[in-house]
């Protein structure tokens, strides 16, 4: 009689992570008596998968009923297949011996490879606000993908950015691979509605690629422009000045009146308005009774905002231009919460 | 199972629609690909569909085909067929696995285009 | 557009023979390669994917291998059956483009 033959007539397999994989072998003869072991690798350090005669192994089942006498099919299936599963698996037959069994004959082996979807990628931006024409990192990361093919692209508002760096870890062979890819973006006072993608595409995407998101209003700070502005006599001595800050954004602003230096008055934003960029508006003004001054009155909105160091922006009110009343140095009444006179 | 139908004898200039039907799985799972073979010619691959619905065609296709699908059906808009596309048309679900092939096939609906 | 050369157009061989298909990419496919075998008037027919894997209920007679730009197609054992042309199939992972080569007829005798 013909000597056995392990047959794994599988060169390789490949599964998809989650499932479960068929490791198929079969034997040529009944003799010699003996079990069948499954290991992954091979040589000393070899893992063992199956043992036909003990052990217990929950994610392994036998295809066939290995108790029957005249069974020669040893393929087994092992359950929720992960990338740590990869690896060659030998099918291999022991002669029954005394104290211990003797390996007999070995398959040829059955390369698994596993593949997994990666992680949808996750952006994240600068810690601190930039301001317009500051160039800002965004990192992107994926995990846990196999094979370690995968392409990455950026884009913002639809646009593909060029100016990024990707690196595939671990270089080497690994069960599974990582992502992560550097951009660098430039960001313009028009950029609080933008939006900055990672898209990742791999063999085992059956959609669209994966994307990753960031919203730019998270990452820009646009400075106000301040316009102080005297307006056109309200009452016989009385002048409305109004400070117009426009174009800032995050909302998060304190404006203080300071009259020769001295504050006179300081409010938080609250009604502003908002423009079609994503930016704020927002006017205070304020009510000044001229008569109460002899001398000329430097008026100045200072804007502290988002935290950052206070911008100003001054006007001079010629209190010469306007006639006073004879001995009055009392102040007009308050007639809004965003009207104060100085006196 | 996959199956194409819409193939006929077509004139030049005049678009036309060729539909995939498929059965035991869902469009919403899988990409989705159009291929044709000329007589006595090899095969070469159109373009495909994404399970989300989005196309992507072969880098000669230059507007000449349009894919789109509905839940169960996917279409081949021929735009302005020549004689030069008078072929048989296969739609295919790529694998399980992957994108990387292709693992059923329907039997292929043949398109003439004459004048 | 990545370029699929595959060799020879046709090959003949005796039944219980071995046949030997060729197929190579104008640049590195990292195993992304698929075998189909097309009979006269019907589909095609996956045999193997990802360079080397069986598509179930292929017969193990279709031995894929391979890697980089060179892939091979071995059929060993043939039987009559295995008359028909094969194809060798690309999907770039960067383009995410497909490819197909020329195609190779066997005729078993």
């Known amino acids: 009689e013909e000597e056995l033959q392990v047959i794994q007539p599988d060169k390789s397999v490949l599964v998809a992570a989650g499932e479960t994989a068929t490791l198929r072998c079969t034997a040529t003869s009944l003799i010699p008596v003996g079990p069948i072991q499954w290991f992954r690798g091979a040589g000393p350090g070899r893992e063992l998968i199956y043992n036909q005669k003990e052990g217990h192994f929950p994610r392994v089942t036998t295809v066939s009923d290995l108790t029957k006498r005249n069974n020669m099919d040893f393929s087994i299936r092992i359950g929720n297949i992960t990338p740590a599963d990869a690896g060659t698996y030998y099918c291999v037959k022991f002669r029954k011996g005394s104290p211990d069994d003797v390996e007999f004959k070995s398959g040829a082996g059955t390369e698994l490879s596993v593949r997994a979807k990666p992680s949808a990628p996750v952006v994240s931006g600068p810690a601190a606000r930039a301001t317009p024409q500051h160039t800002v990192s965004f990192t992107c990361e994926s995990h846990g993908f196999s094979p370690r093919d995968i392409t990455l692209k950026w884009f913002k508002n639809g646009n593909e950015l060029s100016d990024f760096q990707t690196n595939v870890d671990p270089v080497g062979e690994s069960v599974s691979y990582s992502i992560h890819s550097t951009a660098k973006v430039v960001l313009t006072r028009e950029d609080v509605h933008s939006q900055v993608i990672c898209e990742v595409a791999h063999v085992t995407l059956q959609g669209d690629p994966l994307r990753g998101t960031a919203n730019l209003s998270e990452t820009i700070r646009v400075p106000p422009t301040l316009e102080v502005t005297q307006q056109p006599v309200r009452a016989e001595n009385q002048v409305n000045v109004t400070c117009q800050v426009r174009k800032f954004y995050p909302q998060r602003l304190q404006l203080t009146w300071l009259e020769n230096g001295n504050v006179s008055r300081t409010e938080t934003a609250s009604t502003v308005t908002e423009n079609k960029d994503g930016t704020y508006n927002w006017m205070s003004w304020l009510l000044v009774n001229v008569s109460a001054h002899r001398d000329d009155v430097k008026l100045t909105c200072q804007v502290e905002h988002d935290g950052q160091p206070a911008v100003s922006k001054s006007h001079d009110l010629k209190v010469s231009a306007h006639p006073k009343e004879q001995g009055s140095n009392t102040a007009a009444e308050n007639t809004g919460s965003n009207e104060r006179n100085i006196y | 199972s996959v199956e194409e139908s819409g193939g006929r004898l077509g004139t030049p200039g005049t678009p036309l629609t060729l539909t995939c039907t498929v059965s035991?799985?869902?469009?919403?799972?899988?990409?989705m690909g159009w291929f044709r073979q000329a007589p006595g010619k090899g095969l070469e691959y159109i373009g495909i569909?994404?399970?989300?619905?989005s196309p992507y065609y072969a880098s000669w296709v230059n507007g000449r085909f349009t894919i789109s699908k509905t839940s169960t059906t996917m279409d081949l808009k021929m735009n302005s067929p020549t004689t030069e596309d008078t072929a048989t048309y296969f739609c295919?679900?790529?694998?399980?696995?992957?994108?990387?092939?292709?693992?059923?096939w329907g039997p292929g609906t043949l398109v003439t285009v004459s004048l | 557009d990545i370029v699929m050369t595959q060799t020879p157009s046709s090959v003949e061989a005796a039944v219980g023979g071995t046949v030997t298909i060729k197929c190579q990419a104008g640049?590195?496919?990292?195993?992304?390669l698929a075998w189909y075998q097309q009979k006269p008037g019907q589909r095609p027919k996956l045999l193997i994917y990802?360079?080397?894997t069986l598509e179930s209920g292929v017969p193990s007679r279709f031995k894929g291998s391979g890697s980089g730009t060179d892939y091979t197609l071995t059929i060993s054992d043939l039987e009559s059956a295995d008359a028909a042309t094969y194809y060798c199939?690309?999907?770039?992972?960067?383009?995410?483009?497909?490819?197909f080569g020329g195609g190779t007829e066997v005729v078993v005798k």
């Open positions: 295919a679900r790529v694998g399980p696995l992957g994108v990387d092939y292709f693992n059923i």
């Open positions: 035991g799985f869902s469009l919403s799972s899988y990409v």
């Open positions: 569909i994404s399970s989300s619905g």
């Open positions: 640049q590195s496919i990292n195993s992304y």
């Open positions: 990802y360079a080397s």
């Open positions: 199939q690309s999907w770039h992972y960067i383009s995410r483009s497909y490819a």
